[in-house]
């Protein structure tokens, strides 16, 4: 059966960038412009990807493959194959349905997309804040309190566990 | 074919008023979040505004709040963007655009957009 299956079957011979033309006596055609198809042996050409709106074209579509798309600045790229564009913020907001917003007090995003995150509790590593955090950017932790000053006790009373992330004023 | 056509745009006075439109095609409009999406010659893309499936909720950026109103009508599978007191930095391409499946859901990426109409403000 294997041996004639290219004899019963003539589509599986058409290559990628062609189809197997029903309306012609199942010859290879070419894909029609706009279509490709990526792999041989297709009875019809998918239509080729369009990048519209604040979509980019990053690969134009040829006969073999589909066109890409990225995001126009200002806008990235989410989804698989950049399926979808969603709007950046500056850095020391979060994206939300009502535009970007700031970071509340004890989070931060140093990033222009994602969410604002809790800055590092230093005390649950036994550390002391060394650098407040700011709305772009988490705390530094440093030397635990007993470490800085020598003569200090070695006891370091805990943290006040309100909220997590916040760091002592 | 899901599609999105945006209409309305054009040249207008500082001060004056435009009704941008959308038709949606393709797709159960009802049961997505729509956006208007613009872009200034030479400046990175800027959203404006968005509005929920039935209505109910409607967000817009700082910079248009007060002037500009979204609206939609599900019957007519259709956006409108009512622009007025325009300014000269209004000028832009204006796109309508789909928010994905899982718009609002801390994701609010945009799958489905039209070509964009242009509006021009100057006097």
């Known amino acids: 059966f294997e041996r004639t299956r290219s004899l019963q079957d003539p589509c599986s011979n058409c290559p990628a960038g062609t189809f197997c033309d029903n309306n012609r006596n199942q010859i290879c055609s070419p894909c029609p412009p706009n279509s490709f198809s990526s792999a041989g042996g297709q009875r019809t050409c998918d239509i080729c990807r369009q990048c519209k709106g604040v979509f980019r074209t990053r690969k134009e579509c040829s006969s073999t493959s589909n066109a890409e798309c990225d995001c126009t600045p200002g806008f990235h790229c989410l989804g698989a194959g950049c399926s979808m564009c969603e709007q950046d913020c500056k850095q020391g907001q979060e994206l939300t349905k009502k535009g970007c917003k700031d970071c509340c007090f004890g989070t931060f995003n140093d990033q222009k997309r994602g969410i604002c995150r809790p800055w590092t509790n230093c005390s649950l590593d036994g550390k002391s804040v060394l650098v407040n955090g700011t709305k772009e950017r988490d705390v530094v932790c440093g030397p635990s309190p007993a470490d800085l000053s020598p003569g200090a006790s070695s006891v370091t009373p805990p943290a006040p566990a309100r909220e997590p992330g916040h760091s002592p004023q | 074919e899901v599609q999105l056509v945006e209409s309305g745009g054009g040249l207008v006075q500082p001060g004056g008023s435009l009704r941008l439109s959308c038709a949606a095609s393709g797709f159960t409009f009802r049961s997505y979040w729509m956006n208007w999406v613009r872009q200034a010659p030479g400046k990175e893309a800027e959203w404006v505004a968005n509005?929920?499936?039935?209505?109910?909720?409607?967000y817009y950026v700082d910079s248009v709040k007060g002037r500009f109103t979204i609206s939609r009508d599900n019957a007519k599978n259709s956006l409108f963007l009512q622009m007025n007191s325009l300014r000269d930095e209004d000028t832009a391409v204006y796109y309508c655009?789909?928010?994905?499946?899982?718009?609002?859901?801390?994701?609010?990426?945009?799958?489905?957009w039209g070509q964009g109409t242009t509006v021009t403000v100057s006097s």
């Open positions: 509005i929920n499936q039935d209505g109910s909720e409607k």
């Open positions: 655009a789909r928010g994905g499946p899982d718009y609002g859901d801390l994701h609010y990426g945009m799958d489905v």
